[in-house]
Interface confidence: low
């Protein structure tokens, strides 16, 4: 009698390893015999397919040498025209030890930022992944987790979590690892110790101290009022990154100086400032509290100004009184080659006897300050425009202290030469006779606040400055 | 990190209706399919409603045809649940969860719900 | 519908016993059945899904089996945290069923 296909032996699950032979049973009885046809998700397998083996009338399919895209759905559909078809459907699970398909690369970043190493597998049973870092299992919190894909985030990065990773993925088939790859977390610069600022006496040693740290260690660099010091020595050291610089400083001038660290993370750069300011004590001390000795002239910016082997007072305030006066003098000269060409001679003749006083050597070596009237002949004639300009620049708070006052001396606080010839220093260079004298036209608008008296005549001036050229 | 968060329960009296949203992220929403389980105080878990979020198609419980409609915005990567008709027998914690994705078609087949939201409270009662 | 018929509906364990749930289905699920464990207040956790695979981040003391239409969950070795309530479910068909519970309390 006809009889409608029933499948007595239902598909089930089959599990198999890639390059395994998988086997479907799908029994039928009926009569007449069924015509048995397979598919995989719901496509038909062609007869054909050299990959499959029909056996057992159809009854039997193998998949000869299983691979990873040969998971999925199997059915069996019989029909013999009695009734209607019958089908039996199970699953391939194709098992697979776990392989990790986008292993963790090495990775920079800043400090602060999030970072997140890639992790992604495969296999079956579906691996899990955990993450070694250096010998240990990484613990997950708050910052730190194991997303679903495998990769490894981490929030909010920290220098501790600086170090060596590897992903592990494990199934009940085995277990594969990444490769050792390194997280370096950089961190921008930093400054731990800022220079100190100082109010110390001209021709002092101070040395302003800058500490910073970042990933990579920073370099420090000391500008001096907006530029490249360009004196001083600088002495660095570099220990568990932190970098520590000392600038030396011999101290001729006030100034702003600035610390500067920087890191570089890829392209770009980090900076971190930090900034001292160095004011110099009131020098307006009086001339009988120096402290010195009688020496030749030894330096070179005055040579041609003091007299040959002039005696000079050498104020031993400072540690290295020659070098001292004599870079105070140099430094005062530079700023002079600005000045108008009437100017220039006078101011330096004025500042050299300044600073290297004429010496009265005796049991206390004494200082001979030069003579008011000389001091108000370039105060008032000579440099009358480049005086109001300096101190007008001075009650502006442009110089931040009386530093560039030093380098010229009060007048009014100098000693005429009319109460005693023998107590103050004549300015050779500035002698002129009556007529000459006369001839000066007036170089300031303002009236002198002290009548300039008539300088004497002297025959020891090395140069002089003509009356015609200072009319022009 | 895989999220799923339900909103929208409350009390409604029995004939009113609700609308239960369930906000996704941290997974492909467009490639996933959502369902919807609700477990009564004291009682087991009871599957109502799932939709495959790539091709719109919709399954429902016998208890809740006609009923509930369930519905997704991919744009918004966000499951609906709109609930109308309410019986007092409605009364459950509604869980929203997520079918577990895999790269192997039958893992997927037959995957389980491997994500599920904290669940909202929906309180059918005069 | 397929039925999941559940047993035991509860059953008292000691820290350290193994305890095997095991569920029916009212015909051919194939492998489509998962296994969840629930504690009081929260959302449902899975453990195995297609029968016997584990699911990642799941102690491995957890198995699933399979002989026909049914289905056992085993834990090998009691531990505290796993007292709670666990639910088979099958997917085979579109409509998705669970089974009744079964709650694993403390002897």
């Known amino acids: 009698l006809p009889k409608a296909p029933v499948i007595t032996t239902p598909l089930e699950t089959v599990d198999a390893l890639v390059e395994e032979v998988a086997t479907f049973m799908c029994a039928v009885e009926s009569y007449p015999q069924p015509e048995i046809s397979w598919t995989r998700n719901k496509i038909l397998i062609k007869l054909f397919d050299t990959r499959y083996s029909i056996r057992e009338n159809g009854q039997l399919l193998t998949i000869l040498s299983v691979e990873d895209s040969d998971d999925g759905i199997y059915c069996c559909t019989a029909n013999n025209g009695v009734g209607g078809a019958v089908e039996s459907c199970g699953a391939l699970q194709v098992k697979m030890k776990p392989k990790i398909t986008r292993p963790p690369i090495n990775v920079k970043i800043i400090e602060g930022l999030k970072a997140v190493l890639p992790c992604t597998t495969m296999g079956n049973p579906k691996p899990s992944v955990s993450w070694i870092k250096g010998d240990s299992p990484l613990r997950e919190n708050s910052r730190i987790a194991v997303l679903e894909s495998g990769s490894l985030r981490i929030h909010n990065v920290q220098k501790e979590d600086a170090g060596q990773y590897r992903c592990v993925a494990k199934n009940s088939l085995g277990t594969a690892y990444s490769k050792v790859v390194k997280l370096e977390v950089e961190v921008f610069a930093r400054i731990l110790r800022a220079p100190e600022s100082h109010n110390v006496t001209f021709g002092s040693f101070v040395t302003l101290h800058c500490t910073a740290t970042g990933i990579p260690v920073p370099t420090i660099t000391w500008i001096e009022n907006g530029n490249a010091v360009s004196s001083g020595s600088i002495q660095e050291s570099v220990k568990d990154r932190v970098i520590d610089s000392r600038l030396q400083l011999f101290i001729t001038k006030p100034g702003l100086y600035t610390c500067i660290a920087t890191n570089k993370h890829g392209e770009k750069f980090s900076t971190a400032k930090a900034a001292a300011t160095i004011s110099i004590a009131e020098w307006s001390k009086p001339q009988k509290d120096n402290k010195g000795y009688c020496a030749q002239y030894r330096g070179e910016v005055c040579n041609a100004v003091l007299a040959k082997d002039a005696l000079v007072f050498l104020n031993t305030s400072y540690a290295d009184p020659e070098e001292a006066q004599e870079l105070l003098v140099h430094t005062a000269w530079n700023e002079l080659k600005v000045v108008s060409p009437v100017c220039r001679p006078a101011a330096e003749a004025l500042l050299c006897n300044h600073i290297f006083q004429e010496c009265s050597p005796g049991v206390v070596p004494t200082p001979i300050p030069i003579c008011r009237e000389y001091c108000l002949a370039v105060k008032e004639l000579f440099c009358a425009k480049e005086w109001l300009v300096m101190e007008e620049k001075t009650h502006r708070g442009l110089y931040r202290s009386e530093m560039h006052l030093l380098s010229v001396p009060e007048c009014s606080k100098l000693p005429s030469m009319h109460w005693d010839p023998t107590a103050c220093a004549r300015l050779p260079h500035l002698d002129y006779n009556k007529e000459n004298l006369k001839t000066f036209p007036p170089m300031t608008s303002s009236k002198p606040s002290v009548d300039i008296p008539n300088l004497p005549s002297s025959s020891s001036s090395s140069f002089s400055v003509s009356p015609t050229y200072s009319m022009t | 990190e895989v999220q799923l968060v339900e909103s929208g329960g409350g009390l409604v009296q029995p004939g009113g209706s609700l609308r239960l949203s369930c906000a996704a992220s941290?997974?492909?929403?467009?490639?996933?399919?959502i369902h919807w389980v609700r477990q009564a105080p004291g009682k087991g878990l009871e599957w109502v409603a799932s939709?495959?979020?790539?091709?719109?198609?919709?399954s429902y419980a016998d208890s809740v045809k006609g009923r509930f409609t369930i519905s997704a915005d991919t744009s918004k990567n966000t499951a609906y649940l709109q609930m109308n008709s309410l019986r007092a027998e409605d009364t459950a914690v509604y869980y929203c969860?997520?079918?577990?994705?895999?790269?192997?078609?039958?893992?997927?087949?037959?995957?389980?719900?491997?994500?599920w939201g904290q669940g909202t409270l929906v309180t059918v009662s005069s | 519908d397929i039925q999941m018929t559940q047993s035991p509906s509860s059953l008292s364990a000691s820290v350290g016993d193994r305890v095997t749930i095991t569920c029916r289905a009212s015909?051919?699920?194939?492998?489509?059945v998962a296994w969840y464990q629930q504690k009081p207040g929260k959302a449902p956790k899975l453990l195995i899904y297609?029968?016997?695979s584990l699911y990642s981040g799941v102690p491995s003391r957890f198995s699933g089996s399979r002989s026909g239409t049914d289905f056992t969950l085993t834990i090998s070795s009691l531990q505290p945290e796993d007292f709670a309530t666990y639910y088979c479910?099958?997917?085979?068909?579109?409509?998705?069923?669970f089974g009744q519970g079964t709650k694993v309390e403390i002897k």
């Open positions: 969860a997520r079918k577990y994705w895999s790269q192997y078609y039958w893992a997927h087949y037959y995957g389980g719900l491997d994500y």
């Open positions: 941290g997974f492909t929403f467009s490639s996933s399919s």
């Open positions: 939709i495959s979020s790539s091709s719109g198609s919709t």
């Open positions: 015909q051919s699920v194939s492998s489509a």
């Open positions: 297609s029968a016997s």
């Open positions: 479910q099958q997917s085979s068909s579109s409509l998705i069923t």
